[in-house]
């Protein structure tokens, strides 16, 4: 083979290369990108000898070997601000054709941080000695250089260009020359794979004469993976050499006919391809022996098969078709499991909704949050449910629980609260007096006062405005009632004073009972009936001390 | 734009042989596969082969072996099928496809507006 | 070879409604990378054949997304979200798994 002009190594679905020059890393990344590739990354240890080789290749073909460290860029840098993160492998530095933060590393030093200035990452060669395969270059972090000043000791850099595929290097059954171009525009004679898209010249004969013949083909996609130069046969055949010129070309057996031409075969197990020249493993899957949407996975030597069924369906016992997974058996909801065809479906029961940790799982809606809350006054949240509450003076109301309406103090079944007038409002009640009385410091009694004519005492009503003539009874005439503290239980009686704050309705106390002074009388604080969301059934009273808050959207919302 | 210009409809004699062409413009002719479809009247469409003009590498459907002869011209930018023997089971439409991308091998986005073969005596 | 199977017309559709086209295959054409070599292609009356979804459920260029496809390893099913007057033709799909490729028989979308 002929001296190849450039250092590249191909393996896997993609190729290196490298190259002398003192460039910044970012001249050197212009390179890369001119002819479709990035600086390399060495994101394992595998990719790290694959650049180890294309720097032992460019090293060889420097004449003399000079006494000193050289450095070769790769494709790590760190953004300037973007600082250090010793907990990670990359330390916070990233690959220029980006792709994941990862495992692989192989610092030379313990890095200083610095997040003042771009960062960039070389490899440090020792120029004088070869290249060990146990001994792969170290990473050595610096400034990224610029324009004429590229940075101590850097020598050179190193692509990288990725492939959909390669294709195997064509095989000569005599006398010949190959030499690949390869789509980054690198030319080669010794590439162990050759990426998609490169081109082949193949020169026969022994290249001082004239009978020599030449071939071209193109690395191309024939079929899902199948990539191919599109050859029939050995080239260069010459029946001078027969099967012994590099097994006449072919993959596993070579076979010579009584005239100078050969055949190429294959071991039992082994099929020969349409190139006449490689053999691949005899497909077993062929005679499509899997059903119901398996995948035929050939075995080894093409001896037997798998069938191999897509995600969510599993191999039933003839172990050719495939079924339904029943995912719902392995329990992976939290509450509520819905197999489908391949794959299954989690729900949750009415008051949850998805989220929480884990895949599947359920929390409890907040039907009380804010904006969201379906009581009137109180609302508490439960798990997978709520109850509403109402303030004092109110009891719930409505088909759904969720509404508070007006308890009527003056009409309760506790009796009289007043011991003259009642006046029902919002929420409360108030006391009053017929005229010549005046209510007592308590709220609740009347003591006999000044003679006067005109309406009872106690504030007048929007609603009865110039019903009555006469002045209202003096702020001094009313009492300042007051609640029993917050946190009292619900079902303790308690002596309730009326509130005198509001305008209300007046309610005459049935004559019977109306008397100059006397006792007050007990009164009840109604009990707060407790809805859930399902059921709508009322809890007993008691226990529930909890405050309520005015929400955004004029309802009541608590928690 | 990428265009497929095929040759015009062709009335030919029992055992005779037929060449077709297929201009290709607007890309790089030699780097993409062309194939090759036919579609007898009233019915569906059959793949015969294919060409990759960069390197002449062809594909053929077993049946059409024998039947029918890819080749490309890279210096006109155009796609040839030869029919031979031909039969009227050979009376057809035949449309040259274009893959989508360079070297790779599927799918067809782009047709030529097809040529009418007839065979009758 | 591989062999694609089409019925020959599809249910009536109205227009504006939804309407869908099935295929099948005698063996499955995903592939061990994980992609599915299942194609379909549109022929409108006189015309050449036009892809629209390529590699089971990838829209081709230029195609409405009125159009989906989905599938198994062997059954497919073209979708179209809102039928129009201009999809009337006849649905091909087709394997490119395989050499051969090959092509169903196609289906004739019906208005009703």
């Known amino acids: 083979t002929g001296a190849d002009t450039e250092a590249v190594v191909c393996a896997g679905t993609a190729c290196y290369t490298a190259h002398w020059g003192k460039l910044s890393a970012a001249e050197a990344q212009n390179l890369c990108l001119q002819n479709g590739g990035n600086l390399a990354t060495v994101k394992s240890e595998e990719e790290a000898q694959h650049v180890q080789q294309v720097l032992a290749q460019l090293l060889r073909r420097e004449a003399a070997l000079t006494a000193r460290m050289g450095k070769f860029w790769i494709g790590l840098q760190r953004e300037k601000g973007k600082c250090l993160d010793p907990s990670l492998p990359l330390k916070g530095f990233s690959w220029v054709g980006g792709g994941e933060d990862t495992p692989y590393s192989n610092w030379h030093k313990e890095l200083r941080n610095s997040c003042i200035s771009k960062r960039c990452v070389s490899l440090l060669l020792d120029l004088s000695q070869p290249l060990l395969p146990g001994r792969l270059p170290k990473w050595s972090e610096g400034p990224c250089g610029s324009p004429g000043s590229p940075g101590s000791n850097i020598e050179g850099f190193v692509c990288k260009f990725s492939f959909k595929g390669m294709c195997r290097p064509l095989a000569l059954g005599g006398p010949g020359q190959v030499t690949y171009t390869t789509p980054f525009q690198t030319t080669s004679s010794s590439l162990e794979a050759v990426p998609f898209a490169s081109a082949a010249n193949v020169a026969c004969g022994e290249g001082d004469k004239d009978d020599s013949q030449s071939h071209y083909f193109l690395c191309k996609e024939k079929a899902p993976d199948v990539f191919d130069w599109g050859s029939s046969g050995p080239l260069c055949v010459s029946p001078k050499y027969g099967c012994n010129f590099n097994n006449g070309g072919c993959h596993q057996d070579c076979f010579e006919g009584g005239d100078g031409s050969f055949l190429c075969g294959c071991r039992p197990g082994f099929r020969l391809l349409d190139d006449l020249v490689t053999c691949a493993s005899r497909n077993p899957c062929s005679s499509s022996p899997c059903r119901g949407g398996a995948t035929c996975i050939p075995g080894p030597h093409g001896k037997n098969y798998t069938c191999r069924c897509p995600q969510g369906y599993q191999l039933d016992s003839s172990q050719l078709d495939c079924v339904d997974v029943d995912e719902c058996q392995d329990s992976p909801c939290a509450q509520e499991c819905v197999n489908t065809p391949g794959s299954f479906r989690c729900e949750c029961w009415v008051g949850y909704e998805p989220g929480g940790p884990g895949e599947g799982a359920c929390q409890d809606v907040d039907e009380c949050a804010l904006g969201r809350s379906p009581c009137a006054q109180g609302c508490t949240n439960t798990e997978g449910s709520f109850h509403c509450s109402c303030e004092e003076g109110y009891v719930l109301a409505g088909e759904d629980g969720t509404q508070c309406q007006d308890v009527d103090e003056c009409v309760g079944p506790g009796g009289p609260l007043c011991d003259s007038l009642c006046f029902n409002t919002q929420g409360s009640f108030r006391c009053g007096c017929l005229p010549g009385w005046v209510l007592a410091p308590n709220g609740v009694s009347c003591a006999m006062g000044p003679v006067s004519l005109g309406p009872p005492s106690g504030p007048p009503d929007e609603e009865y405005k110039g019903e009555r003539e006469g002045s209202t009874v003096p702020p001094a005439a009313t009492a300042s009632p007051t609640r029993g503290p917050e946190g009292t239980p619900k079902s303790t009686p308690t002596t309730r004073r009326p509130l005198l704050s509001s305008d209300a309705p007046i309610t005459s106390v049935p004559l019977e009972v109306l008397a100059p002074s006397g006792s007050p009388g007990l009164w009840r604080e109604p009990s707060i009936h407790h809805t859930t969301a399902a059921s709508g059934a009322q809890e007993p009273a008691g226990g529930d001390s909890s405050v309520a808050t005015q929400n955004d959207d004029g309802t009541d919302g608590q928690k | 734009q990428v265009q497929l210009q095929q040759s015009g409809p062709e009335l030919v004699k029992p055992g005779a042989s037929v060449k077709i062409s297929c201009k290709g413009s607007g890309y790089a002719f030699s780097t993409y596969w062309m194939n090759w479809v036919k579609q007898r009247p009233g019915k569906g469409l059959e793949w015969i082969g294919r060409i990759f003009p960069g390197d002449g590498d062809t594909d053929y459907d077993g049946k059409f072996k024998g039947k029918a002869t890819l080749t490309a011209d890279k210096s006109s930018n155009t796609a040839y099928m030869q029919l031979s023997s031909l039969t009227s089971e050979d009376s057809a439409v035949y449309f040259c496809?274009?893959?989508?991308?360079?070297?790779?091998?599927?799918?067809?986005?782009?047709w030529g507006q097809g040529t009418l073969v007839t065979v009758s005596a | 070879d591989i062999v694609m199977t089409q019925a020959a017309f599809s249910n009536p559709v109205t227009l504006g409604t939804s309407a869908s086209i099935s295929c099948s295959s005698t063996k499955s054409l995903l592939h061990s990378s994980g992609i599915t070599y299942l194609y379909w292609y549109l022929q409108r009356p006189g015309q050449s054949p036009q892809l629209l979804i390529y590699r089971m459920s990838n829209l081709a260029s230029g195609v409405p997304d009125r159009f989906s496809g989905s599938g198994s390893g062997t059954d497919f099913t073209l979708r179209i979200s809102r039928v129009e007057a201009e999809d009337v033709g006849v649905y091909y799909c087709?394997?490119?798994?395989?050499?051969?490729?090959?092509f169903g028989s196609g289906t004739k979308l019906e208005i009703k």
């Open positions: 087709a394997q490119m798994l395989e050499r051969p490729f090959t």
């Open positions: 496809a274009r893959t989508g991308a360079a070297y790779e091998f599927d799918p067809f986005p782009y």
